[in-house]
Interface confidence: medium
């Protein structure tokens, strides 16, 4: 199971002092910045138990293995479900803590209930403040059952769940019908996926017999040990105030683990620390009791004394859980509870034993999970013990599981089971990723998904030119950092592969798939300069430039023109894709804008030095369109146009421009200037008879303005073909019939 503990500080006089801490004992836990260790997540889960919104809770990371949640401002903030998520990949695990309000109407006799598939679970809610209304039981927030208030038994409302199955797991609550949901009793039901003492996909495998209240995990058969116990079967007590799978963590504060609730991965759930009990874990165990929640009884024999943290402390000459075994009986010593080896390695395993008579080499054997017995190849005999060494044949995945070291003498026998984890060296599933490239170097991210097991201890990057038969170059890198491959050849393809290793002998995995990474072209070195520019309209600019003359071919694919509008903080880039080009027309610019302009040569994706900048001011845009344009045929060759001046003029109009075009005609339109800006009427002459024309016009101040609406009109009668339109204008007189 993942070494993940959620600690709740239950000293509840002041909610502001309340905190939750999630502690991970996993290698690489919580680093979060790399692919091997996703971050520890600690949060309130509002999906089932919703509380009134308050100020956001504060999350503080203390190193890579610990995260703490604080900032609770009122008691109602505490009520509900909290979860911590840790571990990587398939080992990602969620630990859940359920907090009840000490002032609730109903209180759970026991918050966490872990039961086996097919068992009957009984949830008991104790009446703390009576109400004479129905009691509603909910499962995961949905209605489940109703009890009448008269149905309380000895001041408790019971919910009996016969033949429970894994889908029955979840958060249960008991609430008086008209009370606030925050006054509910909240429970957590964990249903193991197998019957008692079994684990595995078909529940065919036998659990190791977890001691001291440990719970057998239904997926992997490991014991999830209560806080304060360690070992494959939780056989070993930690020193007082310590917890974690290897007793590596220390309870905070001077009073040790008092007042702390410990939540561990399912199927364990939550309990007080070893030596403590009560709803707030502040009561020491009664004499004769020990362990988490004081659930264990010592029953020490042969003069052993009961320690509330560790159980029986045996006098000299005795050992065993109840001091029931004489020291004359042989005893396996200091056997690691868990060993890890890499696939296809041939490790040596040592097993030490003592006793009277003294164990010899032949009296110690090693049994594999498949029942195969290994005999030791050599033994080291010391005054107080014999250590047998076993040479293990090449390991296969099926060797994962519980191994057993057994010692037999005429004084009796002892055995110790230990877990062997056969790990698969990691193999990259993908090629490394190119981050950036230059002409002589490549920056590569070696972080890739992989098959097999972590943690990753080293990453090797192998590379060589594509289609080359030369030896691979190798660089060893930190798993969390990007790598720069240097001193490469420009414009060259390189084959790049990743090899991952995990700790231990034989931890190197196979090489991952190759990928082709190509170095960039040489950087262009020539600096162009701007020859000149001229404005071709309020939004158009023609630019020309030159390059210095150098011998040899031009290193470049084209030019990049950049226009910087400092007022708006906008940059416009124009790509000229011919290296021979020395001029470009820039259109769609903003009239009346001050631009900074420069040009640079590019080659592939690389830019050369920019030219010295030039400053260009485009003329402002022209005035608004003339209004109410109207056309009226006067004869077979004349049409009169009338209009009104544009509104909101930025300055005096210098002229009007009329556009004349034959309707449906394919030719270019004709533009005619009206040079007397005070005019509001003009006659267009020299038109063809019986011909439909389109007219529109615009005004000019410093630049040409917007076009007016287009009007249509036909010339009259069948006259002679005219030479072409000309105009005559005059001011339209108000009220005069024209």
């Amino acid at each position: 199971a993942v070494d993940l503990t959620l600690l709740a500080n239950l000293r509840l006089t002041d909610p502001q002092r309340f905190f939750l801490t999630c502690v991970s004992g996993e290698a690489g836990a919580g680093r979060g910045s790399d692919a091997w260790g996703p971050p520890l997540l600690l949060e309130k889960d509002d999906r089932i138990v919703r509380t009134p919104p308050g100020p956001p809770l504060r999350l503080a990371r203390n190193g890579s293995h610990q995260v703490t949640l604080r900032g609770f401002s009122k008691p109602s903030d505490l009520v509900g479900v909290f979860s911590c998520v840790g571990g990587a990949g398939a080992r990602r695990t969620r630990v859940i803590y359920v907090h009840n309000s000490p002032g609730a109407h109903l209180l759970p006799d026991k918050v966490t209930h872990t039961v086996n598939k097919g068992d009957t679970a009984v949830l008991s809610a104790r009446v703390h403040k009576e109400k004479q209304t129905d009691v509603i039981w909910k499962s995961n927030g949905s209605y489940f059952y109703t009890l009448d208030w008269h149905e309380a038994q000895d001041g408790r409302f019971l919910l009996q769940l016969p033949n429970v199955q894994p889908p029955s797991s979840g958060i249960y609550s008991a609430t008086y019908l008209e009370a606030s949901p925050l006054g509910s009793a909240f429970f957590r039901l964990i249903v193991r996926g197998c019957g008692a003492g079994r684990w595995g996909p078909g529940c065919t495998k036998e659990c190791p017999g977890c001691l001291h209240g440990g719970v057998c995990h239904d997926h992997d058969g490991e014991c999830v040990c209560p806080p304060g116990f360690t070992g494959t079967r939780c056989e070993q007590a930690c020193r007082e105030g310590r917890f974690g799978q290897s007793c590596q963590e220390q309870c905070p504060g001077i009073s040790g683990c008092r007042g702390l609730t410990f939540c561990l991965p399912d199927p364990y759930g939550c309990s007080c620390g070893s030596g403590w009990r009560g709803s707030q874990c502040q009561e020491a165990c009664a004499p004769g009791h020990f362990g988490a929640d004081c659930r264990l009884q010592c029953q020490c024999q042969n003069g052993g004394t009961c320690d509330r943290f560790s159980g029986c402390v045996c006098p000299s000459g005795w050992h065993g859980v109840h001091c029931e075994k004489s020291d004359r009986i042989p005893q396996i010593l200091n056997m690691a509870s868990e060993l890890e080896f890499n696939l296809e390695t041939m490790p040596r395993i040592n097993c030490a034993a003592a006793g009277n008579p003294f164990p010899v080499r032949g009296s110690i054997e090693l049994r594999k999970p498949d029942g195969t017995v290994l005999l030791s190849t050599k033994a080291i005999v010391e005054p107080e013990k014999t250590t047998a060494e076993f040479e293990v044949p090449r390991l296969v995945l099926a060797d994962s599981g519980f191994w057993e070291c057994r010692v037999s003498t005429s004084g009796g026998q002892d055995s110790r089971r230990f877990k062997v984890n056969v790990k698969v060296p990691p193999v990259p599933l993908a090629a490394p990723r190119l981050l950036t490239k230059q002409s002589r170097q490549l920056v590569v991210s070696p972080l890739v998904s992989f098959s097999g097991d972590g943690p990753i201890s080293t990453v090797r990057l192998h590379y060589r030119p594509q289609d080359s038969t030369m030896d691979w170059s190798t660089i060893v890198v930190d798993p969390s950092e990007n790598v720069t491959l240097m001193n490469l050849r420009p414009k060259t393809g390189y084959s790049v592969r990743v090899q991952l290793s995990r700790p231990g002998e034989g931890g190197e995995g196979a090489w991952g798939p190759p990928t082709l990474m190509t170095t960039d072209c040489p950087e262009p070195l020539l600096q162009p300069w701007l020859e000149g520019w001229h404005v071709e309209g309020t939004d158009r600019l023609r630019v020309s430039w030159s390059l210095p003359l150098v011998p040899g071919p031009l290193v470049g694919d084209g030019f990049l023109l950049r226009l910087w509008d400092g007022t708006r903080g906008q940059e416009r880039r124009e790509n000229v894709s011919s290296p021979q080009a020395r001029t470009a027309l820039l259109t769609g610019l903003t009239p009346g804008t001050h631009y900074q302009l420069d040009v640079q040569l590019y080659h592939c994706t690389l830019l050369g030095p920019a030219s010295p900048p030039a400053h260009v001011l485009l003329p402002p845009s022209g005035p608004p369109a003339p209004r109410h344009l109207h056309a009226q045929a006067l004869s077979d060759s004349e049409i009169q146009l009338t209009w009104k001046h544009p509104e909101a003029l930025p300055g005096p109009i210098s002229k009007y421009v009329v556009e004349v075009q034959v309707a449906g005609g394919a030719g270019d339109p004709l533009w005619i200037d009206v040079d007397r800006p005070e005019e509001t009427s003009t006659i267009i002459r020299g038109l063809n008879a019986s011909t439909r024309y389109l007219f529109r016009m615009r005004a000019s101040i410093q630049g040409l303005g917007d076009w007016s609406n287009t009007v249509e009109e036909s010339t009259l009668g069948n006259g002679l073909q005219a030479e072409g339109p000309v105009q005559e204008s005059r001011a339209a007189e108000e009220g005069l019939d024209q």
């Epitope: 509380t51 509603i136 909910k138 489940f144 609430t175 019908l177 949901p181």
Partner: antibody
Framework: EVQLLESGGGLVQPGGSLRLSCAAS???????KMWWVRQAPGKGLEWVS?????????YYADSVKGRFTISRDNSKNTLYLQMNSLRAEDTAVYYC??????????????????WGQGTMVTVSS | DIQMTQSPGTLSLSPGERATLSCRAS???????LAWYQQKPGQAPRLLIY???SRATGIPDRFSGSGSGTDFTLTISRLEPEDLAVYYC??????????FGQGTRLEIK
């Protein structure tokens, strides 16, 4: 399909007895409070009795207390109403109904979400 | 015991009109336990609104409930011919007793 089906109604003389049944289907009967509600001809609705899921608690309207008995058989998904000492004023259509609790984050709501089609009980000499 | 009084006794409106039905409790009650039912001629009642304002499953959105304390309202925004029915309000008490209003008959002109 979630449904309730009443049976057992009929004509009975004053002072006589009758047993109504209500068969439930389409939901977990053993989890819900079940009720009998009646409606005299041309009149409004009147609650008669309620029984809790376990069968351990029952309540009656004052007008039927001591004469009617509500019960349930969770294994058969059936609700019963044993009516003794019947009177003319007990003449009505008798409905069985399920009350379902919905809960939000702040409170729970109770309402009759499923009704049977009703069975007519006529008490007349 | 709390009494529930509905008004008017009968309401006669045309299709498309808005119907407003009132229910008054003799003392302040929790809106969580107030429900409205529709009973069409010859049929069993049907739940429309629970918790004073939440629409039951499958009920058209032209039906809405509101109110708190002692005064509660059922509104039908656009009457349809099939809305012809008797409408009852109902209160779940904190004891198992429940109280129905006497009903409002809705007639469609």
């Amino acid at each position: 399909e979630v449904q309730l089906l009443e049976s057992g109604g009929g004509l009975v003389q004053p002072g006589g007895s009758l047993r109504l049944s209500c068969a439930a289907s389409g939901f977990t009967f053993s989890k819900y409070k079940m009720w009998w509600v009646r409606q005299a001809p041309g009149k409004g609705l009147e609650w008669v009795s309620v029984i809790y899921p376990s069968g351990g608690a029952t309540y009656y309207a004052d007008s039927v207390k001591g004469r009617f008995t509500i019960s349930r058989d969770n294994s058969k998904n059936t609700l019963y109403l044993q009516m003794n000492s019947l009177r003319a004023e007990d003449t009505a259509v008798y409905y069985c109904a399920r009350s379902s609790l919905g809960c939000s984050s702040t409170s729970c709501y109770d309402a009759f979400d499923i009704w049977g089609q009703g069975t007519m009980v006529t008490v007349s000499s | 015991d709390i009494q529930m009084t509905q008004s008017p006794g009968t309401l006669s409106l045309s299709p498309g009109e808005r119907a407003t039905l009132s229910c008054r409790a003799s003392q302040s009650v929790s809106s969580s336990y107030l429900a409205w039912y529709q009973q069409k001629p010859g049929q069993a009642p049907r739940l429309l609104i629970y918790g004073a304002s939440s629409r039951a499953t499958g009920i058209p959105d032209r039906f809405s409930g509101s109110g708190s304390g002692t005064d509660f309202t059922l509104t039908i925004s656009r009457l349809e011919p099939e809305d012809l029915a008797v409408y009852y309000c109902q209160l779940f008490g904190s004891s198992p007793r429940i109280t129905f209003g006497q009903g409002t008959r809705l007639e469609i002109k």
